[in-house]
């Protein structure tokens, strides 16, 4: 629009002046005036600001507390926060990843559909007909039943979602 109907995108209004915001990684020390420019200062060590801003204090970087199973995935800068993730075998309880819990295991009769990551839990699925899982595991998928025919054997005991079939020799009398 012409003329402007507001301060420009990276400005803010104060005392009738459109002042420049501070860029990411810097905090506001003093507003601009008729005589002076906006004064900004870089954030200190372990601090950040990730947007154009008029904040007088920088935010502290997130602490990845090892007592909560957390570790640093990406170190913070003056413009970005630290990103935490969980230790091996654990995953975050929320998007913010403030604490971790142990990956769940899939019970017998269930197999792993998706292995857990640092941010998502194990996804289990029931073993369909023809497949089984006889262990509680965070990694094992459902295994297919053994094919007795390919071994020149016959099914002696039917499989379930928790057990494999039991194969046995063919009845020679029927041969």
């Amino acid at each position: 629009p012409e003329p402007p109907t507001a301060c420009r995108e990276k400005q803010y209004l104060i005392n009738s002046q459109c002042c420049s915001l501070c860029q990411p990684g810097q905090k506001l020390v003093s507003d601009c005036t008729e005589f002076t420019e906006t004064e900004c200062l870089p954030c200190g060590e372990s601090e950040f600001l990730d947007t154009w801003n008029r904040e007088t204090h920088c935010h502290q970087h997130k602490y990845c507390d090892p007592n909560l199973g957390l570790r640093v995935q990406q170190k913070g800068t003056s413009e970005t926060d630290t990103i935490c993730t969980c230790e091996e075998g654990w995953h975050c309880t929320s998007e913010a990843c403030e604490s971790c819990v142990l990956h769940r295991s899939c019970s017998p009769g269930f197999g792993v559909k998706q292995i857990a990551t640092g941010v998502s839990d194990t996804i289990c699925e029931p073993c369909p007909v023809g497949f089984f899982s006889n262990v509680s595991s965070a990694f094992e998928k459902c295994h297919p039943w053994t094919s007795c025919e390919t071994k020149d054997l016959v099914v002696q005991q039917a499989g379930t979602n928790k057990t494999d079939v039991v194969c046995g020799p063919q009845d020679r009398l029927r041969a």
Epitope: E2, P3, A6, R8, K10, C18, S20, L21, Q23, T38
Partner: antibody, heavy 125, light 107 residues
Framework: QVQLVQSGAEVKKPGASVKVSCKAS????????MYWVRQAPGQGLEWMGW????????TYAQKFQGRVTMTRDTSISTAYMELSRLRSDDTAVYYC??????????????????WGQGTLVTVSS | DIQLTQSPSFLSASVGDRVTITCRAS??????LAWYQQKPGKAPKLLIY???TLQSGVPSRFSGSGSGTEFTLTISSLQPEDFATYYC?????????FGQGTKVEIK
């Protein structure tokens, strides 16, 4: 203190292009729109357009549309104005100028509070 | 485009004189007007914005007034350093045009 320092004088042949630079210091470059104005020898001031240094989006005066390109490099706080297909009547001093906006009586009033020292571009065969 | 016509184009005056320059717009521009001073070989310098607001650092002998289509720049007591060319600029409608200038010379 705010300073806009422009590149040196240029002599070009008709049909050529010229690229003038304007290096800003003393303020947050991406926070203020940058304008270009030219002045032919002994003549008045002519507005050419502006660039938003944050997004890089330019707006050109109709007269220069298709011949002018305004760009910027935020990493070195520098704005550029390139004029192509030069003619002898493009001989002028080219200025960059920073926009300031004042708010009063419910309106936002722009003006140019800081100017570069000017770059003389001479177009001659 | 909005045309700005300054009068007079040339003005001879003495130190201490009160000087008035007029700027007329071809259509109403509210208070979207600025005044600049330019000395030979130098860049323009902002004096007045929003028609009547004095830019910081500019001596108080300079003043601006007007609204709509008629504007004036007044120098209450001309000083030796005030001999220069003065331009008005409208900032309502693109292109942001300038007046043709008023040259203030020593009488």
């Amino acid at each position: 203190q705010v300073q806009l320092v422009q590149s040196g004088a240029e002599v070009k042949k008709p049909g050529a292009s010229v690229k003038v630079s304007c290096k800003a210091s003393g303020y947050t470059f991406a926070g203020y729109y940058m304008y270009w104005v030219r002045q032919a020898p002994g003549q008045g001031l002519e507005w050419m357009g502006w660039i938003n240094p944050d997004s890089g989006a330019p707006t050109y005066a109709q007269k220069f549309q298709g011949r002018v390109t305004m760009t910027r490099d935020t990493s070195i706080s520098t704005a550029y104005m390139e004029l192509s297909r030069l003619r002898s009547d493009d001989t002028a001093v080219y200025y960059c100028a920073r926009e300031k906006i004042y708010y009063g009586s419910g309106n936002y009033y722009p003006s140019f509070d800081y100017w570069g020292q000017g770059t003389l571009v001479t177009v001659s065969s | 485009d909005i045309q700005l016509t300054q009068s007079p184009s040339f003005l001879s005056a003495s130190v201490g004189d009160r000087v008035t320059i007029t700027c007329r717009a071809s259509q109403g521009i509210s208070s979207y007007l600025a005044w600049y001073q330019q000395k030979p070989g130098k860049a323009p310098k902002l004096l007045i914005y929003a028609a009547s607001t004095l830019q910081s650092g500019v001596p108080s002998r300079f003043s601006g007034s007007g609204s709509g289509t008629e504007f004036t720049l007044t120098i209450s007591s001309l000083q030796p350093e005030d001999f220069a060319t003065y331009y008005c600029q409208q900032l309502l409608s693109y292109p942001w045009t300038f007046g043709q200038g008023t040259k203030v010379e020593i009488k």
